[in-house]
Interface confidence: low
């Protein structure tokens, strides 16, 4: 066969769907690889062809679009399952071609089983709510395109296993779930089950997401440097190891990049000749506030090193701060015999 632009297996789009539920899967070519959409391709005389490789098989085979009740069908650039079966798991390929042009991409589709509490191997999206921030809402995700706007589905919300009814701060409102005041106790998995009719049959869509209650922007502050500080002096003799921790607290800020770095005499450690190592550790609070610690270490410090300026810097979307460490050379204790000699000499 003639050459085809093969984008390979697009593992970035690992698609997971629940068993025995409808699934609509768009050909990724038009979403991520080609600069034109399906309508343009279709009007230019290009044809979209689907085929698949079953799990644990190497053989590519056409998709059977003649199953009872049109269980698998194609509509424009969408492959439909009404509903899925467990053995639909495999790698699916969509190929766009005519006599002179060919482009294809494969993607994995995994049909997943869930238990009665909606637990499954499905990777869950995380929705972050600000703690005690006023009313916030989550929306039942990825249900667009399954039924026309004239169809009014029923939507039931669950927290973990439990139907959300009479929760004092969580209220189901159709496709939305409203949190009147988000608390740590609202952390957990929330599931919406959308039920709709189609051609005399009833279908269910199950969507689970994880709610994580995080620090509120109302309480966010610029980075706070706990160490170094004015109370601790790093007093060392030449030849000793110098260890200076820089410990910085960052309020949670959505999409903020938190940075901590050291400068030595105004330069980054990489830009100077002394043998310095820096180790970083990160911890998070329950509301995803972050504490970063960078320990600056010089194995055998010299007199010159003890005269340098060591400054810890921190930056977040809220601002930038810096703090110098107090480093000094330990004054050797006077030797007793010398003191005596001096004493006698003075009399």
């Amino acid at each position: 066969s003639e050459r085809c632009d093969d984008w390979g297996l697009d593992t970035m789009r690992q698609i997971q769907v629940f068993e025995d539920e409808p699934a609509r899967i768009k050909c990724p070519l038009f979403e991520h690889f080609l600069k034109f959409n399906y309508s343009t391709a279709h009007s230019a005389g290009l044809t979209l062809i689907w085929y698949w490789t079953r799990q644990d098989r190497d053989l590519e085979e056409p998709i059977n679009f003649r199953l009872p009740e049109n269980r698998i069908s194609k509509e424009k650039d969408v492959l439909w399952f009404r509903p899925t079966l467990l053995n639909d798991t495999g790698n699916y390929t969509c190929m766009l071609r005519n006599t002179t042009y060919c482009s294809k991409v494969a993607f994995p589709l995994e049909v997943v089983q869930k238990d009665s509490c909606f637990n499954s191997p499905m990777k869950l999206p995380v929705h972050k709510l600000y703690i005690e921030y006023g009313i916030q809402r989550i929306t039942c995700p990825n249900v667009d395109g399954y039924f026309p706007s004239s169809v009014k589905p029923t939507i039931t919300w669950y927290m973990g296993c439990y139907k959300i009814q009479n929760f004092n701060n969580v209220i189901p409102e159709g496709m939305n779930l409203s949190f009147l005041i988000a608390l740590i106790s609202n952390n957990g998995n929330y599931t919406c089950v959308v039920t709709y009719p189609e051609n005399g049959r009833t279908f269910h869509l199950t969507r689970t997401l994880t709610v994580k209650v995080v620090g509120s922007p109302k309480n966010a502050v610029p980075p706070v440097i706990h160490s170094p500080n004015d109370h601790v002096v790093y007093e060392k003799e030449p030849g000793e190891e110098l260890l200076i921790p820089c410990t910085v607290y960052f309020s949670f800020l959505m999409d903020s990049r938190n940075e901590v770095w050291w400068t030595i005499d105004g330069k980054k450690p990489d830009d100077i000749t002394i043998d310095v190592t820096i180790n970083e550790s990160i911890s998070h609070s329950r509301t995803e506030d972050e504490t970063r610690t960078q320990i600056l270490s010089i194995k055998k410090v010299t007199s010159e090193d003890l005269k340098r300026s060591y400054v810890c810097h921190a930056r977040s979307a809220k601002g930038e701060v810096a703090k110098a460490a107090k480093v000094k050379q330990k004054v050797p204790a006077p030797r007793y015999t010398v003191e005596l000699a001096c004493g006698f000499g003075a009399t």
Epitope: F167, S185, N187, S285
Partner: antibody, heavy 116, light 108 residues
């Protein structure tokens, strides 16, 4: 650990504030409750203060209790004590980041006696 | 408000025996229920949360079961150290906090 204080003999109607000093953890990370136990009787939940300062109360005290906190203490104010408020008052820390709200850590309690 | 009813009020069993304590909620609280043990002069101690999950450090002789309105605490292979009063507590978000009346366990 949790350590309650402030329990004493008071006359009816005299406001009283109990304190719970926390150590080993931060009140910015845990919700806290007050529970009381009347002599020879069972346990009664009074209320909870969440990490952000929001409070929730049982319905039976009808507004006689107020819970507040600082960075290291959780306070329970009994605005107008009656003889029925004679009890040992416990503060307790909720379990943590699951939503089952169990009381996992308790103080030793402080005794309040209301008598004329 | 939810009301928690605990039975029996008192039970006596020999060392090595089994004790079953029941707790009934006046409305469904799903599995939002905890069990506590309290000895004289001491604060309560959490044994079980979420109806059946054992708190860390609690011996596996203690077990909890139930869902909705009916819950059970079972203590098997009874030891003298198990003599105490046991309480259930509703932890459901809309009606948090109510305790059962308590069950005194006497070990003979």
């Amino acid at each position: 650990s949790l350590e309650e204080s402030g329990g004493r003999l008071v006359t009816p109607g005299t406001p009283l504030t109990l304190s719970c000093k926390v150590s080993g953890f931060s009140l910015s990370s845990y919700d806290m409750s007050w529970v009381r136990q009347t002599p020879g009787k069972g346990l009664e939940w009074i209320g909870t203060i969440y990490i952000g300062g929001t409070t929730a109360y049982a319905s039976w005290p009808k507004g006689r209790f107020t819970i507040s906190k600082t960075s290291t203490t959780v306070d329970l104010k009994i605005t107008s004590p009656t003889k029925e408020d004679t009890a040992t008052y416990f503060c307790a820390r909720l379990q943590g980041a699951n939503y089952y709200n169990s009381l996992a850590l308790w103080g030793q309690g402080t005794l309040v006696t209301v008598s004329s | 408000d939810v009301v928690m009813t605990q039975t029996p009020a008192s039970v006596s069993e020999p060392v090595g025996g089994t004790v079953t304590i029941k707790c009934q909620a006046s409305q469904s609280i799903y599995s939002f229920l905890s069990w506590y043990q309290q000895k004289p002069g001491q604060p309560p101690k959490l044994l079980i949360y979420a109806a059946s999950d054992l708190e860390s450090g609690v011996p596996s002789r203690f077990s909890g079961s139930g869902y909705g309105t009916e819950f059970t605490l079972t203590i098997s292979d009874l030891e003298s150290a198990d003599a105490a009063t046991y309480y259930c507590q509703c932890n459901y978000i809309i009606d948090y906090g109510a305790f059962g009346g308590g069950t005194e366990v006497v070990v003979k």
